[in-house]
Interface confidence: low
């Protein structure tokens, strides 16, 4: 089994590892499927691409019957199977079978924390946000290891790329020193950013 690892939105080339001449195409059936779901078929030279892969999949007949998947999504991850059948003696017989495992990485970048003052009060608001990761993130604010209550945490998913964005607001009293950590957990991974507030200089120091 061949393993291919790519970042989300990148291009993946999955090779069948087999060549068929133009002359043989009329007597050949080629199937690409992913975990028993069809991706692409070519029968007697006629190609059919399934809706989930339309407009983002290229069949490269000249390059080992490879499929090229553009703009990778997290759901593209899985095991792909290429089957080549050839017509011999009144029946199609299997000539070749190959498996390719595709891993799609979608890591959230380190979150950014922006801050602004709420007029006529001692309250300051910080917003932690990051986007472009998978699976669904869970954001928490911590101070001295204690979890804090955010005002509003928004998790959204792009229907095209399947990637998530997350942002969260936290209000704090600017008359005391603070060190807040914005922690984002997704799957078995995590990213974080720290925001420090110093009352003496009335300025903040993001931990970069």
């Amino acid at each position: 089994v061949i393993h291919v690892t790519k970042e989300v939105k990148e291009v993946a080339t999955l090779s069948c590892g087999h060549n068929v001449s133009v002359e043989e195409l009329a007597q050949t059936r080629i199937y690409w499927q992913k975990e028993k779901k069809m991706v692409l078929t070519m029968m007697s030279g006629d190609m059919n691409i399934w809706p989930e892969y339309k407009n983002r999949t290229i069949f490269d007949i000249t390059n080992n019957l490879s499929i090229v998947i553009l703009a990778l999504r997290p759901s593209d991850e899985g095991t792909y199977e290429c089957v080549v059948l050839k017509y011999e003696k009144d029946a199609f017989k299997r000539e070749h079978l190959a498996e390719v495992t595709l891993s799609v990485k979608a890591d959230f970048p380190t979150p950014s924390i922006s801050d602004f003052e709420i007029p006529t009060s001692n309250i300051r608001r910080i917003i932690c946000s990051t986007s472009g990761g998978f699976p669904e993130p869970h954001l928490s604010w911590l101070e001295n290891g204690e979890e804090l209550n955010a005002i509003n945490t928004t998790v959204s998913q792009d229907p095209e790329t399947e990637l998530y964005a997350v942002s969260s607001k936290l209000d704090f009293n600017m008359t005391t020193n603070h060190s807040f950590m914005c922690l984002i957990k997704y799957g078995h991974l995590r990213v974080n950013q720290t925001f420090n507030w110093n009352t003496t200089k009335q300025e903040h120091f993001p931990d970069n």
């Epitope: 928004t154 959204s156 792009d158």
Partner: antibody
Framework: QVKLQQWGEGLLQPSETLSRTCVVS?????????WTWIRQTPGRGLEWIGH????????NYNPSLKSRVTISKDTSKNQFFLNLNSVTDADTAVYYC???????????????????WGPGDLVTVSS | AYELTQPPSVSVSPGQTARITCGGD??????VHWYQQKPARAPILVIY???DRPSGIPERFSGSKSGNTATLTINGVEAGDEADYYC???????????FGGGTRVTVL
């Protein structure tokens, strides 16, 4: 073609709980959609109450109603629900269930609209 | 909170052009959507993403945007166009729709 049908109690007394059901036909409740509740009063116009995401359990509520509102769904029955407790006469309105494609979310969301609406029904809160 | 401002009413003669405006502080960066609502009926989406028209909506309805003001234009107004019209944007910070106050179009 997706259609929404809705029902629930039409007359409530103050402090009671408003409950509404919306049935989705002609399509699945799962998918990249926000299933939404909106209400309309002559004074306040169209007011978004909240929504639930078709592909998960994510909900979002109008901050002014958040403490009183719950939106849920039953995927197996292709239905979603609104519960609004401790109603007052200010909750008298026409209530609509609706569907909106999930907005395009890159860094933050933009672009969402409401493409399918239920017929709406009047809920009156009166003692 | 995000606010959208519409004129309360617009009057127009049959066959003329009706223009309804919708203004918001940051509308230039948001897609604006428009709904038509006739008495005792649910709203209908007539324009989405500033200027796109859903299938089944007559070509007489069009949308445009200049700066922070979006405009719904109804060419060759008919008696059946008499209705309330609402603009809407998506409040990106709070992840929910925000509606304008509505404009009543009266066909004289």
């Amino acid at each position: 073609q997706v259609k929404l049908q809705q029902w629930g109690e039409g007359l409530l007394q103050p402090s009671e709980t408003l409950s509404r059901t919306c049935v989705v036909s002609g399509g699945s409740i799962s998918g990249y959609y926000y299933w939404t509740w909106i209400r309309q009063t002559p004074g306040r116009g169209l007011e978004w109450i909240g929504h639930i995401y078709g592909n998960g359990a994510t909900t979002n509520y109008n901050p002014s109603l958040k403490s009183r509102v719950t939106i849920s769904k039953d995927t197996s029955k292709n239905q979603f629900f609104l519960n609004l407790n401790s109603v007052t006469d200010a909750d008298t309105a026409v209530y609509y269930c609706a569907r909106g494609p999930r907005p395009d979310c890159t860094t933050i969301c933009y672009g969402g609209w409401v493409d399918v609406w239920g017929p709406g029904d009047l809920v009156t809160v009166s003692s | 909170a995000y606010e959208l401002t519409q004129p309360p009413s617009v009057s127009v003669s049959p066959g003329q052009t009706a223009r309804i405006t919708c203004g918001g502080d940051n509308s230039r960066n948001e897609y604006v959507h428009w709904y038509q609502q006739k008495p005792a009926r649910a709203p209908i989406l007539v324009i989405y993403d500033d200027s796109d028209r859903p299938s089944g909506i007559p070509e007489r309805f069009s949308g445009s945007k200049s700066g922070n003001t979006a405009t719904l234009t109804i060419n060759g107004v008919e008696a059946g166009d008499e209705a309330d019209y609402y603009c809407q944007v998506w409040d990106r910070a709070s992840d929910h729709p925000v509606f304008g106050g509505g404009t009543r179009v009266t066909v004289l």
